[in-house]
């Protein structure tokens, strides 16, 4: 907390400019009007303030807006955003995607901080659902964002948003998350033809039930082993040797390299040896 002292004669700030970097902390506190700061927030980022000076500026804004900053100020916080605590951010009402982008840009290249997580949470809750534009923005900054959400949070993703999801966005998703996302993807891509559908749905197949895998096996999709390894164990176990052969097509030979790994190991174990032998891969049940 900076002590309240009178502003020295002639030092009262008329605007936010570079001269302020020479002000001591107490001078900033005494000589910079909070309302002026709020209206000229966009200038703060162009001025090389020290961390200590930024603390003073934040303190002034906190005093001016004890219930939380208005979006007009939030959008121009820039590096001052890094000074905000999750508690500060919980007071905000961020509705503009441009504001969200501006603040994410400040944190770009770093892992998701508690501040950013709180900001995103506030934004998404304010919108009521994770729409396509928001998802596009978030996954651009944080490819792992989708997989950081709980299954309950993912249930608010409308099928239309699924079009924004790239394969790499699902890399760290676990089965419970894919269980939620797969039916949405199936709905989103339902009007596509066979080969195009498979290209789009492939990343989501970790949530597919047995009957959908059986249906895919009839469509000459040639699923690669990496995708097969991500399938649910309970969905793979009931597949016959013939169905797996059709599902994988020329990639079926890859089963040999994965025979000690789940779910391939579990599937092999439950097949008749005579059926496995038809693959000619030397798989032992």
């Amino acid at each position: 907390e900076v002590e309240k002292t009178a502003c020295p004669s002639g030092k009262k700030a008329r605007e936010i400019d570079e001269s302020l970097i020479f002000y001591k902390k107490w001078e900033l506190e005494a000589c910079v009007d909070a309302a002026l700061l709020a209206t000229q927030m966009d200038r703060v980022n162009a001025i090389p303030f020290t961390y200590e000076q930024l603390d003073v500026l934040k303190h002034k804004l906190d005093e001016l807006y004890p219930q939380g900053y208005p979006e007009s100020v939030i959008q121009h916080l820039g590096y001052l955003f890094l000074k905000m605590s999750p508690e500060d951010i919980r007071k905000w009402n961020v509705t503009s995607l441009e504001t969200l982008k501006a603040l994410l840009e400040v944190n770009k290249g770093h892992e998701m901080s508690p501040q950013v997580a709180t900001l995103i949470d506030r934004f998404v809750k304010g919108r009521g659902q994770l729409d396509k534009d928001t998802l596009d923005t978030l996954t651009a900054f944080y490819p792992g964002y989708l997989c950081s959400l709980s299954p309950e949070e993912l249930s608010s993703v409308p099928p239309s948003s699924i079009w924004a999801v790239r394969p790499q966005d699902l890399d760290t998703c676990d089965p419970r998350q894919l269980d939620v996302l797969y039916p949405k993807a199936r709905l989103a891509f339902q009007n596509m033809n066979g080969s195009e559908y498979f290209v789009k749905i492939q990343s989501f197949l970790g949530g597919a039930p047995t009957e959908d895998l059986k249906a895919l096996s009839q469509q000459n999709v040639s699923m690669d082993l990496a995708t097969f390894m991500k399938l649910r164990t309970d969905a793979v176990l009931p597949l016959t040797v013939a169905e797996v052969q059709k599902l994988l097509g020329p990639h079926v030979e890859g089963l040999k390299a994965e025979e000690r790994h789940r779910p391939v190991r579990d599937w092999i174990l439950r097949q008749r040896q005579d059926d496995l032998d038809t693959l000619g891969l030397g798989l032992q049940g």
């Epitope: 676990d174 089965p175 419970r176 390894m229 991500k230 164990t233 309970d234 176990l237 000690r260 790994h261 789940r262 190991r265 579990d266 174990l269 439950r270 032992q284 049940g285």
Partner: antibody, heavy 119, light 107 residues
């Protein structure tokens, strides 16, 4: 409610073969989803998986014990068994049998039986 | 074989504390990691399977996360009955390895 019960001698001489049986009650050893494992825990130490068997007779063993281990299943008696040959004092441990549901993990365990290797 | 390294090997905590135990696999085990709790003289009990799924009957204060090589077991608010040893285990590779265990003791 599936329950498992280990049985067998509590004392085995060095160089002999340790033999234990696990009896499955309240369920079937022939269950489609389940694998039946043996796991051991030396006194004051951590858990070591020994191997599993499927009702079809297919087995999988810990590579470090493979040369000495045999696990078998008797579906008519609803039992599976462990044989560990050429034992030494290092094989002294609590031996557990456990069911592994392919979709979860070792969800049901026996209460364990202490086997001491000593002359 | 995939080696599982747990840390810390022991920790002291108080009732109500948030406790985090980590497990690192020597190579990817995807999301195939299970967590067990063992009390002295008793058989282990399955808490979490497939990295983050809560086993039926296990209190919701237990949660798991992670994929690939890094996994975490979290107890959100430690209860008196939670003082025990915790083990991670990977069933992805056929070698079925366990971590060395983490003993959670009363501070």
């Amino acid at each position: 409610q599936v329950q498992l019960q280990e049985s067998g001698p509590g004392l085995v001489k060095p160089s002999e073969t340790l033999s234990l049986t696990c009896t499955v009650s309240g369920g079937s050893v022939s269950s489609y989803h389940d694998l039946w494992s043996w796991i051991r825990q030396p006194p004051g130490k951590g858990l070591e998986w020994i191997g599993y068997i499927y009702y079809s007779g297919s087995t999988n063993y810990n590579p470090s014990l493979k040369s000495r281990v045999t696990i078998s299943v008797d579906t008519s008696k609803n039992q599976f068994s462990l044989k560990l040959s050429s034992v030494t004092a290092a094989d002294t441990a609590v031996y557990y049998c456990a069911r592994e549901d392919a979709l979860t993990g070792f969800d049901i365990w026996g209460q364990g039986t202490m086997v001491t290797v000593s002359s | 074989d995939i080696q599982m390294t747990q840390s810390p090997s022991s920790l002291s905590a108080s009732v109500g504390d948030r406790v985090t135990i980590t497990c690192r696999a020597s190579q990817s085990s995807r999301y195939y990691v299970n967590w067990y709790q063992q009390k002295p003289g008793k058989a282990p009990k399955l808490l979490i399977y497939a990295a983050s799924s809560l086993q039926s009957g296990v209190p919701s204060r237990f949660s798991g996360s992670g994929s690939g090589t890094d996994f975490t077991l979290t107890i959100s608010s430690l209860q008196p009955e939670d003082f025990a040893t915790y083990y991670c285990q990977q069933p992805y590779d056929a070698s079925y390895t366990f971590g060395g265990g983490t003993k959670v003791e009363i501070k």
